[in-house]
Interface confidence: low
């Protein structure tokens, strides 16, 4: 008789999840010499231990502590780029500007980027059929808790000037419910972080509005100021040109506003 299985509202664990995590770990440690000491099998075991045999609506940050310990990594605290709803451009930027880092440029962020995972209570099975949706099912699911944990640690590590890339095409350029708005903003350390600089990325070619005056950006400024951190904002009117100018800063067209 087939055992009854909980049907969740979200997509199931990413196909070939264990192989993906392990292979990404191997690849990352090859690319980053400072992480060569990492034992990827132990990393996978710790990752698996965080959610296997546990109810997928009852995951805690504590479950991920063994993985956090193994994935401990020092990134230059003044070279951190946060992002909200504009991951692809943020990643393209750090691919070019190699001395800056998004969360997904760290080992733990890299391992989990674009993946979904969950287990089942009291069995060692990975659930490939469905996983809890953050809104429809529960917020304490394996994926949400993982990103909340690593995002908090990443923000806590930041210092000096922290940059954040925001999507100017969205109705809420700054969204209090995003990971950036609900976790990272509140875990920047005022004694270490001097300024949060927002880069608002424009979508339309002819869009010349000053999106730094958007009400949600003003809301972000208010939250940050109350935390005794300075706030600055820049419009990136031409994201394509912005990337080109990061690659070729000596280009004569890069002196004008982008």
């Amino acid at each position: 008789v087939p055992r009854w299985r909980q049907q969740w509202s979200g997509p199931g664990t990413t196909k070939r999840f264990p192989e993906t995590v392990l292979a990404r770990c191997v690849k990352y440690t090859e690319i980053h010499p400072e992480m060569r000491h990492v034992d990827c099998q132990s990393v996978w075991d710790a990752f698996k231990g965080a959610f296997i045999s546990k109810h997928p609506c009852n995951i805690t940050e504590e479950d991920y502590q063994p993985l956090m310990k193994l994935g401990t990594q020092t990134v230059p605290c003044n070279k951190i780029l946060l992002w909200s709803r504009i991951k692809d451009l943020a990643h393209q930027f750090t691919q070019v500007q190699r001395d800056m880092f998004t969360l997904e440029d760290t080992l733990l962020g890299y391992l989990a980027d674009d993946l979904t995972w969950c287990g089942e209570f009291n069995t060692s099975k990975i659930n490939y059929q469905s996983c809890p949706d953050w809104r429809k099912d529960c917020s304490n699911n394996p994926v949400s808790v993982f990103w909340k944990t690593v995002s908090r640690r990443f923000a806590e590590a930041a210092c000096d000037v922290v940059h954040v890339m925001l999507n100017g095409s969205r109705s809420k350029i700054f969204d209090k419910n995003s990971t950036f708005g609900s976790v990272e903003v509140h875990n920047l350390q005022p004694e270490k972080v001097q300024t949060l600089e927002a880069w608002v990325i424009h979508g339309g070619r002819e869009d010349s509005r000053d999106l730094c005056q958007d009400p949600t950006i003003k809301e972000l400024e208010s939250i940050i100021s109350k935390r005794n951190i300075q706030f600055s904002c820049k419009n990136i009117y031409r994201p394509d040109k912005f990337l080109q100018c990061v690659k070729n800063p000596e280009d004569s067209s890069c002196t004008s506003e982008i």
Epitope: T14, A23, R24, K27, D88, Q92, E104
Partner: antibody, heavy 124, light 108 residues
Framework: QVQLKESGPALVKPTQTLTLTCTFS??????????VGWIRQPPGKALEWLAL???????RYSTSLKTRLTISKDTSKNQVVLTMTNMDPVDTATYYC????????????????WGQGTLVTVSS | DIVLTQSPATLSLSPGERATLSCRAS???????LAWYQQKPGQAPRLLIY???SRATGVPARFSGSGSGTDFTLTISSLEPEDFAVYYC?????????FGQGTKVEIK
């Protein structure tokens, strides 16, 4: 270095089954993150992705051709075999095999090394 | 299936000129999974760009890729004689992994 070579019949009759073999060296299909796929190109036309087999025997196929395609691997021989049933003159093309490898940040990937291709003509 | 539409179909330029090739996806593709290939007559395609913007090994710096979501661009900053060829974009985001129909860069 990584090399792939396609082999199979140059001429196939309509309704027959085509069997193509990709023999490769310089990597192992039992290694995590490796895959071998097939892509074809009719004369003067664009590339068309056909099928992919991964190190863990996971198989994926073109939507329009999946009922006619079967991909398999023999890891010990470093070979991947593609069979395509019910061949038609419109299937005349150069058939390429290619390695699919892992890159920075990726779970699903793009072919990075290709064989030189083999021209298959379908005619009675 | 994700459909990739490349434009223009043909680009007629002179050596030394800048070439801009476009690839538009029918649905959003993570930039991590977008690649560009170069194909010369009688040869197999050669990987130029992966992850939308990363040059493959041995690819000259005059080739660059950019874009995200549904719009991607391959730029050749200054065409060399050996760059005249057909260029294809390809997505590895959703199976089946589709190709664009190609852009031919020809000598004017």
């Amino acid at each position: 270095q990584v090399q792939l070579k396609e082999s199979g019949p140059a001429l196939v009759k309509p309704t027959q089954t085509l069997t193509l073999t990709c023999t490769f060296s310089g990597f192992s299909l039992s290694s995590d993150g490796m895959g071998v796929g097939w892509i074809r190109q009719p004369p003067g036309k664009a590339l068309e992705w056909l099928a992919l087999i991964d190190w863990d025997d996971d198989k994926r196929y073109s939507t329009s051709l999946k009922t006619r395609l079967t991909i398999s691997k023999d890891t010990s021989k470093n070979q991947v075999v593609l069979t395509m049933t019910n061949m038609d003159p419109v299937d005349t093309a150069t058939y390429y095999c290619a390695r699919f490898n892992w890159f920075y940040r990726l779970a699903f990937v793009n072919p990075d090394v290709w064989g030189q291709g083999t021209l298959v003509t379908v005619s009675s | 299936d994700i459909v990739l539409t490349q434009s223009p179909a043909t680009l007629s330029l002179s050596p030394g000129e800048r070439a801009t090739l476009s690839c538009r996806a029918s649905q959003s593709v993570s930039s991590s999974y977008l690649a560009w290939y170069q194909q010369k007559p009688g040869q197999a395609p050669r990987l130029l760009i992966y992850g939308a913007s990363s040059r493959a090994t041995g690819v000259p710096a005059r080739f660059s890729g950019s874009g995200s979501g549904t719009d991607f661009t391959l730029t050749i900053s200054s065409l060399e004689p050996e760059d005249f060829a057909v260029y294809y974009c390809q997505q590895g985001y959703n199976s089946p992994f589709t190709f664009g129909q190609g852009t031919k860069v020809e000598i004017k």
